[in-house]
């Protein structure tokens, strides 16, 4: 048993048929001595009394909350959940795996830039009766300091009959050094809290493998005289580092014509113009990525060649 | 060529070559999630490579101020990596043909310490640890996380040569 | 894109040879090895051996030497794999493959194969 | 030689259901193993190198596990369109070898 926050205990618990479970001893939070009371959750049934309650967690209908009482008064309150572990690995049964880019990964991960500025979040198919917290540091063993908001319900989509809830969160590092070379990677911790049911969830990364940057901005076609080339321009995000002659991108620019059938014409350049062929109903698109290190491609910006 | 004393390099050549550099070792591991290199084993293997950290002056400012060490802690990383791409870890099993990146990777790191360090003057370069991985599976774990660790060096090195060439060339 | 176009089927007589050939596009030829393989009929793949069209180096299974020949010609873009001697069990589709850009040989691209009929 | 051992060398399952292939190097290959699909009378496929990855535009039934000896082909969900031959090979050392064959029907 460990306290996960002040009056809330998390038990551990070795889950299969007719396992033991683990013996808790409670101690009433006060300078009384006698006439001490415990009770479970709304019932009045009287569990035990004196200043300390041993009782045998096996299963969810032992966690809850744990009050002590003398003489109807309220004295203190432990709220006790259960993290179950079932054949040596801890249950993921509160976030949904998201199998992307492997699997068992329910936290992804993305920064817009190097600044040291990331955003996780996580699916649930959970409606109701969750709470999340979030901790993050870089390395584990001498941790340095990252700051992380309130995970906060970010989008809802229905998925056939299920509907599916996304959480995230924002996470700043608090003396984030964009130029250098990372050796120690961020490290993520989200506590998932679901009615009496407790799991936790890591990430590691280094913050160059999650750089996914907002797709290029002022994407403008030119028509060249006499031709059916036009020259493409557009310009680096807003939400890049800078200065970009250090941070350099690298941009794709594709034409495509309306049939997703139709064969796609592909450029890739460092530079902010292109000159390409702008074919009859066909779109051109932009997406740009680290020049220099192959993270995320952005999405793509799009404008049509008429 | 960068010249004992702190003359500049030959911006424009280094950026080239620098960018090559982060091509080739992207080529010769181009996987990102195929398996947590940071979940295995061999911990202290990867673990004195040379870093560009925070305090190397290899930021914009920094290399405006005195680009002299920032240079220094790359061409120390060059030197490095050269050598292990030259060591057993990298012949042996699992084979690797003769088309492999690595070749030219090796070559190319070389090419461009030369470019950063005149023959006859000699910034001091860090020790190699010595390491014979016995096992196929061992010395494949090596290979991923150097070359893993080589991907992250090299972009901070381009990034350098590149941000020199535009601002701080002649 | 990368392309891999194998010259037709052949049929032999014992103690012949044959040249299969192996046409490649879409890349630049020198930068890879070209791989051979054999399938005989209802069997698994057996690896042959590789060129190496930029130092023109080939690379053989043990058990095929003396047996192939495998060349490139750098003008044409073309590989050639020579089975000399030829017996019934040499019956076999051939394919000729590349591999991986990252130097390990896993293939990525292959040829369409060529059956060589071997009989009396 | 490094001998690759695959098992079984038929197989017959239903639409839907989870399928497994074996492959047993006779020594150590690191994860230095691909999977091929051939269907009939065409050219082999990659689907999964480095023993668990998966090639581009291989759908996620497909997945790979294991290293040094011991390998996995997994079909989680059989599809009419997986009916083929499939192959492990390994490519740590010369010469390099593949499995027998694993011819998958639908039942």
């Known amino acids: 048993i460990w306290e996960l926050k002040k009056d809330v205990y998390v038990v551990e618990l070795d889950w299969y048929p007719d396992a033991p479970g683990e013996m808790v001893v409670l101690t009433c939070d006060t300078p009384e001595e006698d006439g001490i009371t415990w009770t479970l959750d709304q019932s009045s049934e009287v569990l035990g009394s004196g200043k300390t309650l041993t009782i045998q967690v096996k299963e969810f209908g032992d966690a809850g909350q744990y009050t002590c009482h003398k003489g109807g008064e309220v004295l203190s309150h432990s709220l006790l959940l259960l993290h179950k572990k079932e054949d040596g690995i801890w249950s993921t049964d509160i976030l949904k795996d998201q199998k992307e880019p492997k699997n068992k990964t329910f936290l992804r991960c993305e920064a817009k830039n190097y600044s040291g500025r990331f955003t996780c979040w996580w699916l649930t198919t959970i409606s109701t009766d969750l709470t999340f917290s979030v901790k993050s540091s870089r390395g584990s063993s001498d941790p340095q300091g990252v700051t992380c908001g309130a995970a906060t319900l970010s989008a809802e989509r229905v998925r056939g009959d299920n509907k599916e809830y996304e959480y995230s969160v924002e996470c700043q590092e608090d003396s984030a050094c964009p130029a250098a070379e990372e050796s120690l990677p961020i490290e993520v911790m989200v506590d998932a809290v679901h009615k009496l049911k407790y799991e936790n969830y890591t990430s590691s990364f280094f913050i160059r493998d999650i750089i996914k940057p907002d797709p290029p901005k002022n994407l403008q076609l030119k028509p060249l005289k006499n031709s059916r080339q036009v020259e493409v321009s557009w310009e680096y995000p807003d939400t890049w580092s800078t200065p970009h002659s250090y941070f350099s991108l690298t941009f794709c620019v594709q034409v495509q014509g309306k049939s997703k059938r139709e064969k796609k014409d592909r450029v890739f350049t460092d530079k902010t113009s292109a000159t390409v062929i702008c074919r009859k109903n066909a779109s051109i698109s932009v997406r740009a990525q680290d020049r220099y290190y192959s993270s995320s491609w952005s999405e793509w910006a799009s404008v049509p060649c008429s | 060529r960068a010249v004992p004393g702190g003359s500049s390099p030959a911006w424009t050549q280094c950026q080239q070559l620098s960018q090559k550099l982060c091509t080739l070792a992207w080529s010769a591991h181009p996987l990102v999630g195929h398996m947590d290199l940071r979940e295995e084993g061999d911990e202290e293997t990867t673990n004195d490579v040379p870093h560009i950290q925070c305090g190397d002056g290899c930021d914009p400012q920094g290399l405006r101020d005195n680009s002299q060490f920032c240079l220094q802690r790359i061409h120390q990383g060059l030197i490095f990596y050269e050598k292990l791409l030259g060591s057993d870890i990298f012949t042996g099993e699992p084979s690797l043909l003769p088309d492999s990146p690595v070749g030219q990777l090796h070559a190319s790191l070389l090419g461009l310490s030369q470019l950063l360090q005149p023959e006859g003057h000699h910034w001091e370069t860090q020790q190699i640890p010595s390491l014979s991985p016995s096992q196929p599976w061992q010395r494949l774990l090596l290979r991923f996380k150097i070359l893993r660790s080589l991907q992250a060096f090299v972009a901070v090195a381009a990034r350098v040569f590149a941000h020199g060439a535009a601002t701080l060339s002649p | 894109q990368v392309q891999l176009v194998q010259s037709g089927a052949e049929v032999k007589k014992p103690g012949s040879s044959v040249k299969v050939s192996c046409k490649a596009s879409?890349?630049?030829?020198?930068?890879?090895?070209i791989h051979w393989m054999r399938q005989a009929p209802g069997q698994g793949l057996e690896w042959i051996g590789y060129i190496y069209p930029r130092d023109d180096s080939p690379k053989y299974n043990e058990n095929f030497k003396g047996k192939v020949t495998i060349t490139a010609d750098k003008s044409t873009s073309t590989a050639y794999m020579e089975l000399s001697s030829l017996r019934s069990e040499d019956t076999a589709v051939y394919y000729c493959a590349i591999p991986d850009r990252s130097g390990y040989a896993f293939f990525i691209y292959w040829g369409q194969g060529t059956l060589v009929t071997v009989s009396s | 030689d490094i001998q690759m051992t695959q098992s079984p060398s038929s197989l017959s399952a239903s639409v839907g259901d989870r399928v497994t292939i074996t492959c047993k190097a006779s020594?150590?290959?690191?994860?230095?193993v691909a999977w091929y699909q051939q269907k009939p009378g065409k050219v082999p496929k990659l689907l999964i190198y480095w023993a668990s990855t998966r090639h581009t535009g291989v759908p996620s039934r497909f997945s790979g596990s294991g290293s040094r000896t011991d390998f996995t082909l997994t079909i989680s969900s059989l599809q009419p369109e997986d009916v083929a031959d499939y192959f492990c090979?390994?490519?740590?050392?010369?010469?390099?070898?593949f499995g027998s064959g694993t011819k998958l029907e639908i039942k």
């Open positions: 090979h390994q490519y740590s050392s010369y010469p390099f070898t």
């Open positions: 020594r150590d290959v690191a994860i230095a």
């Open positions: 879409g890349y630049t030829f020198t930068d890879q090895t």
